[in-house]
Interface confidence: medium
């Protein structure tokens, strides 16, 4: 399965909006500062194709989650989700539409599966540090943050993976 | 590869104002935070502040308060620190420094760019 | 404010000898500890982040270790160029602060 080239040009889009809706400086959150253990091992590049599509569509639904939520909505400008929401459910589309074409239909093998976990469990980090924090202004800077760092390693990922076709 | 660029030596007298800029060649600096610290002849580094140009966020170290203003101009990818009430003591070069990371917020807060420094003297 | 102090604040020292300085914060900073290198008459250079992270394009000599009050930056093998001034700085909270530096000379 080919991801679109729309697909790149729409993750470059995503990284944008998520730098756009900065509210606040990091500098005045230096207190806030987290490692959620963002679990890089599971974006090497040693995934065959079959087994990254579902990773990576894991990642992106992941943060459609947390974007998503009625605190994410009163932190963020709501023109500006609106527009993440829209490139994240694009993504997903495409993902989507790679494994209806036969990639990674056949039984998941046992790597994936760990790898879709520790996505879910570097997420639960995350909301639990929101929630802790009780959707300060500066956790969710730190969140958002974060989250451009880990959606931009895996959009790495996605480049490394066309480049190889 | 993005460098800072700084303006030249200055030379000002006690109760004068000083302004350096530093210039950002070679890509733009809305997404990074940049420091000024500075080090007097044989001395130390001392942190002056910072600015975050994108929000317009300035954090200045209590020393320097209400002395010291530091802004920028987007359209030039330009920072300015401005230090008023010159006194002897504040002869030093003044450096502009780039924050490590425009984007990662985990332990990466260090300046990996620098500016060529500015030397500023205060003499009567 | 949290004070960084560093140890000894000179050493002499031949090419090919370890070398290591140490840094104390008065108060525990976790890992926001850097290490920089600086030579007369030019800006400070970037080794360490993180306390141990070394910088890209660093030698691997260059390493550091330490968490909460104590650091320590170890060059393996001092190289002709090493000799210069390293300063550490803690990014904890603000304001940001250095330590006074260690100025290592050939002896």
């Known amino acids: 399965c080919d991801l679109p080239q729309t697909h790149s040009l729409g993750s470059r889009r995503t990284l944008m909006l998520l730098a756009q809706m900065r509210k606040i400086s990091l500098f005045s959150c230096l207190k806030d500062r987290h490692d959620f253990g963002f679990p890089q091992e599971e974006f090497g590049n040693q995934f065959q194709k079959a087994e990254t599509i579902p990773v990576l569509h894991e990642m992106i639904q992941q943060i459609f989650n947390l974007f998503s939520t009625k605190d994410s909505s009163a932190a963020w400008d709501e023109t500006l989700l609106d527009k993440f929401y829209t490139e994240l459910y694009q993504q997903l589309n495409d993902l989507e539409a790679c494994v209806i074409q036969g990639v990674g239909v056949t039984e998941t093998p046992l790597m994936k599966e760990d790898s879709i976990l520790a996505v879910r469990k570097y997420f639960q980090r995350i909301t639990l540090y929101l929630k802790e924090k009780k959707y300060s202004p500066c956790a969710w800077e730190v969140v958002r943050a974060e989250i451009m760092r880990s959606f931009s390693l895996s959009t790495n990922l996605q480049e490394s993976l066309r480049s190889k076709e | 590869q993005v460098q800072l660029v700084q303006s030249g030596a200055e030379v000002k007298k006690p109760g004068a104002s000083v302004k350096v800029s530093c210039k950002a060649s070679g890509g733009t600096f809305s997404s990074y935070a940049i420091s000024w610290v500075r080090q007097a002849p044989g001395q130390g580094l001392e942190w002056m502040g910072i600015?975050?140009?994108?929000?317009?966020?300035?954090r200045y170290a209590q020393k320097f308060q209400g002395r010291v203003t530091m802004t920028r101009d987007t359209s030039t990818s330009t920072v300015y620190m401005e230090l008023s009430s010159l006194r002897s003591e504040d002869t030093a070069v003044y450096y502009c420094?780039?924050?490590?990371?425009?984007?990662?917020?985990?332990?990466?807060?260090?300046?990996?760019?620098w500016g060529q420094g500015t030397l500023v003297t205060v003499s009567s | 404010d949290i004070q960084m102090t560093q140890s000894p604040s000179s050493l002499s020292a031949s090419v090919g000898d370890r070398v290591t300085i140490t840094c104390q914060a008065s108060q525990d900073i976790s890992n926001y500890l850097n290490w920089y290198q600086q030579k007369p008459g030019k800006a400070p250079k970037l080794l360490i982040y993180?306390?141990?992270t070394l910088q890209s394009g660093v030698p691997s000599r260059f390493s550091g270790s330490g968490s909460g009050t104590d650091f320590t930056l170890t060059i393996s093998s001092l190289q002709p160029e090493d000799f210069a001034t390293y300063y550490c700085q803690q990014t904890y909270s603000t304001p940001i602060t250095f330590g006074q530096g260690t100025k290592v000379e050939i002896k």
């Open positions: 993180g306390a141990s």
């Open positions: 420094a780039r924050s490590l990371f425009p984007t990662i917020f985990g332990v990466e807060v260090a300046f990996d760019i």
């Open positions: 600015i975050d140009p994108s929000v317009t966020y300035t």
